[in-house]
Amino acid sequence: SEVEYRAEVGQNAYLPCFYTPAAPGNLVPVCWGKGACPVFECGNVVLRTDERDVNYWTSRYWLNGDFRKGDVSLTIENVTLADSGIYCCRIQIPGIMNDEKFNLKLVIKPAKVTPAPTRQRDFTAAFPRMLTTRGHGPAETQTLGSLPDINLTQISTLANELRDSRLANDLRDSGATIRGSSDYKDDDDKHHHHHH
């Protein structure tokens, strides 16, 4: 079964995923998707890396660890209840059926009615989007169909799996700035380099 992680509405959620590159800079493509890991790829892809860089991401989804060292943990910014569900981290190791895949269950709790005042970090300031407009997007649009989401009523609570989302804030401090180019001129929520 999936390992369970938690965050509160309005916080950032942290979903850990790691691998060990064969050599420094010798990266393996990784994808993150909403929904359990299918046989290939990652359900509805929200972020992916190639052998060099993060080449596709969507709004609110970030890699804040050092992905060049194999830390491909996902941060989801400012979560809502709709972010609950299963997420797939897939390490796409070349070869015959070599992929490693991990299903992580994210449980979002309603925000406390009277939260203690906390300092909100400026996520955009910490990780500015370095955007250019290199206009070659996908040659055709794929309709994203309905993919597996977990029903909130089915989610069990595992107290020992609690992940304080403030930990994710601390981890961000050592993260690398992610640069990308926007290929969707009319959609600020999707950013990617083409993968060729």
């Epitope: 596709y56 040659a139 794929q142 309905s146 993919l147 597996p148 993968h195």
Partner: antibody
Framework: EVQLVESGGGLVQPGGSLRLSCAAS????????MAWVRQAPGKGLEWVAN????????YYLDSLKSRFTISRDNAKNSLYLQMNSLRAEDTAVYYC???????????????WGQGTLVTVSS | DIQMTQSPSSLSASVGDRVTITCRAS??????LAWYQQKPGKAPKLLVY???TLAEGVPSRFSGSGSGTDFTLTISSLQPEDFATYYC?????????FGQGTKLEIK
Amino acid sequence: EVQLVESGGGLVQPGGSLRLSCAASGFTFSDYYMAWVRQAPGKGLEWVANINYDGSSTYYLDSLKSRFTISRDNAKNSLYLQMNSLRAEDTAVYYCARDVGYYGGNYGFAYWGQGTLVTVSS
Amino acid sequence: DIQMTQSPSSLSASVGDRVTITCRASDNIYSYLAWYQQKPGKAPKLLVYNAKTLAEGVPSRFSGSGSGTDFTLTISSLQPEDFATYYCQQHYGSPLTFGQGTKLEIK
């Protein structure tokens, strides 16, 4: 219009080899996983193999991976299946199919070729 | 391997009938299920993917439902061109596997 056209089928003796080809057009070939699926005469569908966008990752039916090799040439928009040590039970129509794309989402073989018949017999 | 079991194996129905074909997976496949229609001598045609999303160009009389292990394909009002063999297929575990097929015949 998306088109997949298989070729290379035919009659081959047991123990022989064949190389099937699939020519793709009408879409960005390198944006999609591709697959081979086969169907023995009067039988159901059986998945054979898949390959990722650039050919670096391949996936096989366990019983076939020592004899069959899937590959692709994105510059030629072509998919291949090298079949060695063929057996009578490999007799089937072999279909080339387009699988999931670069952004995920659509899990199903959306487009199929017309198929090419491979007959293994002495 | 994940086994896909379709029922019934064959079915006789009349034009205008409502028909339901079921597919059961031996393990949880979430919603990674596709349905295909195949006519004799032709390649299969994708009808539904991700359990309930209708493929492009497929008439709205076809619908898919289910998740986890139990899935259904429903044809709300059979048309003459719908008589064919139908297959389900899972895209969750390796190897990819198909159901054995359901042959839909004219009564």
